[in-house]
Interface confidence: low
Amino acid sequence: FVRTKIDTTENLLNTEVHSSPAQRWSMQVPAEVSAAAGDAAVLPCTFTHPHRHYDGPLTAIWRAGEPYAGPQVFRCAAARGSELCQTALSLHGRFRLLGNPRRNDLSLRVERLALADDRRYFCRVEFAGDVHDRYESRHGVRLHVTAAPRIINISVLPGPAHAFRALCTAEGEPPPALAWSGPALGNGSAAVPSSGQGHGHLVTAELPALNHDGRYTCTAANSLGRSEASVYLFRFHGASGAST
């Protein structure tokens, strides 16, 4: 399921281009596209240009992060007169042109979405041959990747004064709320320790003092689901183990 939010579209005049009044350079992209991790998303991008019936060589490019300077994630080239844009770059093989640049459509499909794909993308078209011109979307399209929580690390570490502390790190979008439960904490304790902190899609919560032996469970929850992982503390046996 892919949701496209078309709040704003770009219709930016490239003042460097001497164009007929009929058609100017412009690019139309949605403000945001939202899709779930693991799914595919389509990033729409269509354009107009001032070069009537241009049929020469062209290159279509998508970059991530920032316009003009961000790393390219996709690039293809079409020979003169050809409807086929030959892929020259597809990062990790997950990017595929869905549109046809010859028909003013640069729409891109991104397969197997990951949270790391949550960023802004910019489409660009370059004409070569008898016409030399290029244009790139300035605002781009934000790809919003949603994901149910996943606990990526849970561990018990030595703390001050021979105490132990526990760390739980989870990822998800929206960023999940973390809660610890365990001996003397009460079951299903919803209180996230004040040391909980987020970095992008990652959230970490620390349980600063494990005062009792037993099983400590970290629960991560957001609007899309929940995930649990546990660690066991056995101080008298001189070891601690983790089980997920």
């Epitope: 009929a22 058609q23 009537r52 019936h53 020979a79 007169g81 050809s82 409807e83 086929l84 030959q86 595929r96 869905l98 046809n100 028909r103 003013n104 459509d105």
Partner: antibody, heavy 130, light 107 residues
Framework: QVQLVESGGGVVQPGRSLRLSCVAS????????IHWVRQAPGKGLDWVSV????????YYADSVQDRFTISRDNSKNTLYLQMNSLRAEDTAVYYC???????????????????????WGQGTTVTVSS | DIQMTQSPSTLSASVGDRVTITCRAS??????LAWYQQKPGKAPKLLIY???SLESGVPSRFSGSGSGTEFTLTISSPQPDDFATYYC?????????FGQGTKLEIK
């Protein structure tokens, strides 16, 4: 000779499903995009759907989006149109037609040119009626 | 979607007359336009592609012209076999819309 032959038409009740087939012969099926075009009785031509030569791109008219599915089996030289939730207004003669051709050199696609729908089948009639 | 408007809807002509059919697109489609001929009970036949390129085997009395939004199909001297219905079709966008058709009748 080069030809396309449609089949699978018939009379069906509203809300039911039907699958049309189009068998190609006389040309390299896997190098051509193929369309479905329909024509209601006494009316003009109405584009329905297209599928690229390798099945990678599929496009639909708004009127059939989410109800019809185009597919192809290049090993069988066959095109399909799965029609679900049929309506009275889907009553028409359905044609398959081939479009522009790709050019391959040593197994690598180097070009794709569109030259209109140059070969058409004879059509198969679909009637949606209760 | 791009709308294609043909005119006239019906055209009466005599054998040998010069006939012109017009097709207008609701937005610029470059030269991505095809013309088809259809006879009753038969499948359409491609005449012209890329606005002015003559399909192989089509008589030279048929010609196409135009670009952008205005296109014409001309039959320089219609023969009895040419009296049929003609359709234009754009393939600039992936909703390959047809015009509503022009029926060429014998006067």
């Amino acid at each position: 000779q080069v030809q396309l032959v449609e089949s699978g038409g018939g009379v069906v009740q509203p809300g039911r499903s039907l699958r049309l087939s189009c068998v190609a012969s006389g040309f390299t099926f896997s190098t051509y995009g193929i369309h479905w075009v329909r024509q209601a009785p006494g009316k003009g031509l109405d584009w329905v759907s297209v599928i690229w030569y390798d099945g990678s791109h599929k496009y639909y008219a708004d009127s059939v989006q989410d109800r019809f599915t185009i597919s192809r089996d290049n090993s069988k030289n066959t095109l399909y149109l799965q029609m679900n939730s049929l309506r009275a207004e889907d009553t028409a003669v359905y044609y398959c037609a081939r479009e522009g051709m790709i050019t391959m050199v040593r197994g690598v696609i180097i070009d794709y040119q569109y030259h209109g729908m140059d070969v058409w089948g004879q059509g198969t009639t679909v009637t949606v009626s209760s | 979607d791009i709308q294609m408007t043909q005119s006239p809807s019906t055209l009466s002509a005599s054998v040998g007359d010069r006939v012109t059919i017009t097709c207008r697109a609701s937005q610029s489609i470059g030269r991505r336009l095809a013309w088809y001929q259809q006879k009753p009970g038969k499948a359409p036949k491609l005449l012209i592609y890329k606005a002015s390129s003559l399909e192989s085997g089509v008589p030279s009395r048929f010609s196409g012209s135009g670009s952008g939004t205005e296109f014409t199909l001309t039959i320089s001297s219609p023969q009895p076999d040419d009296f049929a219905t003609y359709y234009c079709q754009q393939y600039h966008s992936y909703s390959y819309t047809f015009g509503q058709g022009t029926k060429l009748e014998i006067k």
